[in-house]
């Protein structure tokens, strides 16, 4: 019947669209994976350095506290709050040093997270442009198929054609706006 003919003719166009979209998405995933690996490799030395410094600070803190602990154990009569007063500056010093290391790490990592965000934004922009062009192409093909069919079965298909074209158009619009929304979200992070 007319409907099965229509399905036959539209089938390859729809399938081609989804196949291409899948390829585009897979390409984006692989490129992003590569970007992440590159950034990780650049960042790793800073993380290793941060861990080493953190361990050193902990070790120094233990050494500085040990004389106080030893004296207390040996029976030096000392009120608890006096001990806390002595420990407090050491704790503050360690916290300040740790904060300095964290700040240094944050400073080192900032350019890489920006770079990653920009790369992803560029990839999505490219996908949006390619996707938009392809959707227009499929839209044209579908229109052409419908026109050919409608010559043969004009009365039966006219209503169907009128209903289907807006559906394709709205799919195109919603696909592009979803991509646009994701790009915006990415840029505001």
């Amino acid at each position: 019947s007319t409907f099965s003919k229509l399905r036959e003719q539209l089938g390859p166009v729809t399938q081609e669209f989804w196949d291409n979209l899948e390829k585009e998405t897979e390409g984006l995933r692989q490129e992003m994976s590569k970007d992440l690996e590159e950034v990780k490799a650049k960042v790793q030395p800073y993380l290793d350095d941060f861990q080493k410094k953190w361990q050193e600070e902990m070790e120094l803190y233990r050494q500085k506290v040990e004389p106080l602990r030893a004296e207390l154990q040996e029976g030096a009569r000392q009120k608890l709050h006096e001990l806390q007063e002595k420990l407090s500056p050491l704790g503050e010093e360690m916290r300040d040093r740790a904060r300095a290391h964290v700040d240094a790490l944050r400073t080192h990592l900032a350019p890489y997270s920006d770079e990653l965000r920009q790369r992803l934004a560029a990839r999505l922009e490219a996908l949006k442009e390619n996707g938009g062009a392809r959707l227009a192409e499929y839209h044209a093909k579908a229109t052409e198929h419908l026109s050919t069919l409608s010559e043969k079965a004009k009365p039966a298909l006219e209503d169907l054609r009128q209903g289907l074209l807006p559906v394709l158009e709205s799919f195109k619009v919603s696909f592009l706006s979803a991509l646009e929304e994701y790009t915006k979200k990415l840029n505001t992070q």
Partner: nanobody, 115 residues
Framework: QVQLVESGGGLVQPGGSLRLSCAAS????????MSWARQAPGRQREWVTS???????DYADSVKGRFTISRDNANNTVYLQMNNLKPEDSAVYYC?????????WGQGTQVTVSS
Amino acid sequence: QVQLVESGGGLVQPGGSLRLSCAASGTITRSPTMSWARQAPGRQREWVTSILGTGRTDYADSVKGRFTISRDNANNTVYLQMNNLKPEDSAVYYCYTVLNGRPSWGQGTQVTVSS
């Protein structure tokens, strides 16, 4: 357990220098962090300086620029070079380390700075 023995203490005039040594023996599998502390009569025992396995050093503000800690890993010995000594540096100086949460202390060596 690690055994620590200090030496090199003595009587010195203000402005003078002394070099303390701390020899470690026992089970030492790596270069542990080694430290010096001191205690004057009637005073709190205080941390003076440390040298980490990496070679990094740290000093109490009161001795910065005057004292230098160093180590000889081959002989398991730590040194404390004390220059421009002041009367307030007079104390018993102890060498110590904390290995796997276990502290080990030497018996101490007396340093007296007096004219």
